[in-house]
């Protein structure tokens, strides 16, 4: 099943490589111009 | 040395599912990083798929993600792409890349699937 | 989803050449707890899986040679080969590793003039 996780900073994940970017949650992304 | 090879059909038919098998040496699929499945169709840029963490949580993306699952098989140190409904537009070639914090440092040959009646 | 443009979409250089390819994100890939741009870039020839060049916008991977580098902040990257060589001559792509869904650049493919 498809998780939400991956949304903290990577210093804070205990494994050694955990392989997931940022995908930090108060980022917005710019309208298309 | 790490190395990811994917493995599956060459060919397959419209509405048909799609399945294809990343297997990875060098390390233990339990032990770090994330798989991510990226495409690439003829002559065109690349789109991520999709991943699962060494923990076995996914994420897909969400232009793909009603027609996704992504599994793996711990015990074979494989990983598994099924997509449903294929269609002509998704003829490309499937990758799999292993993925740490930063990029996609180790990627596999490649397979191509075409989709076709 | 973040959109990646990179410019131009093919270029026409000789051996020794010094050569700059640009990429602009539709936002930030600054992480303001690390300080570090997640932007990637990856060298592909034909039949083959791209290779990882660069992370974090300017760390060369392992073995890649040091004519290339690569900078930039915030939405704007370059990369730039100091002196092409022949082994050179492939399309390039950047990659955003910030936000899912991870997504790409078009590609420049660099040709021999």
């Known amino acids: 099943s498809e998780t939400t996780t991956g949304t903290s900073s990577n210093s804070s994940q205990s494994t050694s490589n955990s392989g997931l970017a940022p995908n930090p949650t108060n980022a917005t992304t710019k309208a298309a111009g | 040395q790490v190395t990811l090879k994917e493995s599956g059909p060459a060919l397959v038919k419209p509405t048909q599912t799609l399945t294809l098998t990343c297997t990875v040496t060098?390390?233990?699929?339990?032990?770090?990083?994330?798989v991510s499945w990226i495409r690439q169709p003829p002559g065109k840029a690349l789109e991520w798929i999709g991943y699962?963490?060494?923990?076995?949580?996914?994420r897909y993306n969400p232009s793909l993600k009603t027609r996704l699952t992504i599994s793996r098989d711990t015990s074979k140190n494989q990983f598994v792409l099924t997509m449903t409904n294929m269609d002509p537009v998704d003829t490309a070639t499937y990758y799999c890349?292993?993925?740490?914090?930063?990029?996609?440092?180790?990627w596999g040959q490649g397979t191509t699937v075409t989709v076709s009646s | 989803d973040i959109q990646m443009t990179q410019s131009p979409s093919s270029l026409s250089a000789s051996v020794g050449d010094r050569v700059t390819i640009t990429c602009r994100s539709s936002?930030?890939?600054?992480?303001?707890?690390?300080?570090?741009?997640?932007l990637t870039w990856y060298q592909q020839k034909p039949g083959k899986a791209p290779k990882l060049l660069i992370s974090?916008?300017?760390t060369r991977a392992s073995g890649v040679p040091s004519r290339f580098s690569g900078s930039g902040s915030g939405t704007d990257f370059t990369l730039t080969i100091s002196s092409l060589q022949p082994e050179d001559f492939a399309t390039y792509y950047c990659q955003q590793y910030f936000i899912y869904p991870l997504t790409f650049g078009g590609g420049t493919k660099l040709e021999i003039k």
């Open positions: 060098g390390y233990s699929i339990t032990s770090g990083y994330t």
């Open positions: 890349a292993r993925g740490t914090t930063a990029s996609f440092d180790y």
């Open positions: 974090w916008a300017s």
């Open positions: 699962i963490q060494y923990t076995g949580s996914t």
């Open positions: 936002q930030s890939l600054l992480y303001s707890s690390d300080q570090k741009n997640y």
